[in-house]
Amino acid sequence: MMTGTIETTGNISAEKGGSIILQCHLSSTTAQVTQVNWEQQDQLLAICNADLGWHISPSFKDRVAPGPGLGLTLQSLTVNDTGEYFCIYHTYPDGTYTGRIFLEVLESSVAEHGARFQIP
């Protein structure tokens, strides 16, 4: 039985050109995490394998950095990065757990609305 739950950073609004950290945490299970995939709209961004370590997809190498931990750092954000991101935890013996984070990337002009941009 799958007892675990995924906690995420929560949805994030960030400014174009900035960077953000996407993180998920699997709790309430003793299952072993064998691999974590990070995906966006059916595109694989990165894989963190328990044995082989990190692999960043070639098309994202310039803007995606591994970590912290099992998280992912997205840099030089563009408006086209707006969308839903998935952390997919492959575990044994439980199976697969998925977390969802929506990232909204805003043009700088939106600052006049008083939005608190999140750039670490």
Epitope: G10, N11, I12, S13, Q41, E104, H113
Partner: antibody, heavy 119, light 112 residues
Framework: EVQLQQSGPELVKPGASMKISCKAS????????MNWVKQSHEKNLEWIGL????????SYNQKFKGKATLTVDKSSSTAYMELLSLTSEDSAVYYC????????????WGQGTSVTVSS | DVVVTQTPLSLPVSFGDQVSISCRSS???????????LSWYLHKPGQSPQLLIY???NRFSGVPDRFSGSGSGTDFTLKISTIKPEDLGMYYC?????????FGGGTKLEIK
Amino acid sequence: EVQLQQSGPELVKPGASMKISCKASGYSFTGNIMNWVKQSHEKNLEWIGLINPYNGGTSYNQKFKGKATLTVDKSSSTAYMELLSLTSEDSAVYYCARGFRGYFAMDYWGQGTSVTVSS
Amino acid sequence: DVVVTQTPLSLPVSFGDQVSISCRSSQSLANSYGNTYLSWYLHKPGQSPQLLIYGISNRFSGVPDRFSGSGSGTDFTLKISTIKPEDLGMYYCLQGTHQPWTFGGGTKLEIK
């Protein structure tokens, strides 16, 4: 002035599919995400999902995955929601609502489209 | 999914009253950057819902200052300081911090 003009009421038969339109005006259509919300007869509101008109990216409430399909036509600044394999449970008022940039809220709403599923 | 619980379900009022509506979530609505995406809406009969408050406590454009929002974490409150006839209707809170976005069950503000 921001306006979201939805298509008119629909009476459809069980098992059929239908598409609701939401024409946006008064702002740059690709600059805000578009949400869709269901209001059932019990009066509760449910978030169906959203679409980003800039790149067509979507995010769905899992409850509505396979039931609703969200699309946009940038050339006419129109968002669409197709409802599939309709049953009486889908009888409701459906709203499109513009995302309020930076706050994950909805700042402007369409007038609503009433959908009745009946044989 | 995050469960959002609104109380009370019904709120009988007299014009001029001050009232509070509570909204509680099953997990914290603060994201990892400290931002909380909690908004409030008024749905009047025959109209579309309208945004009142966003980001816990910010009044949307044109919303009278008799409406105020407060709270943090999992516990949020909408206050209306002096009830007027145009305030009657259904009030909903919405959390947009976690996918999927979820609404509270609504509070009906009606005349006593």
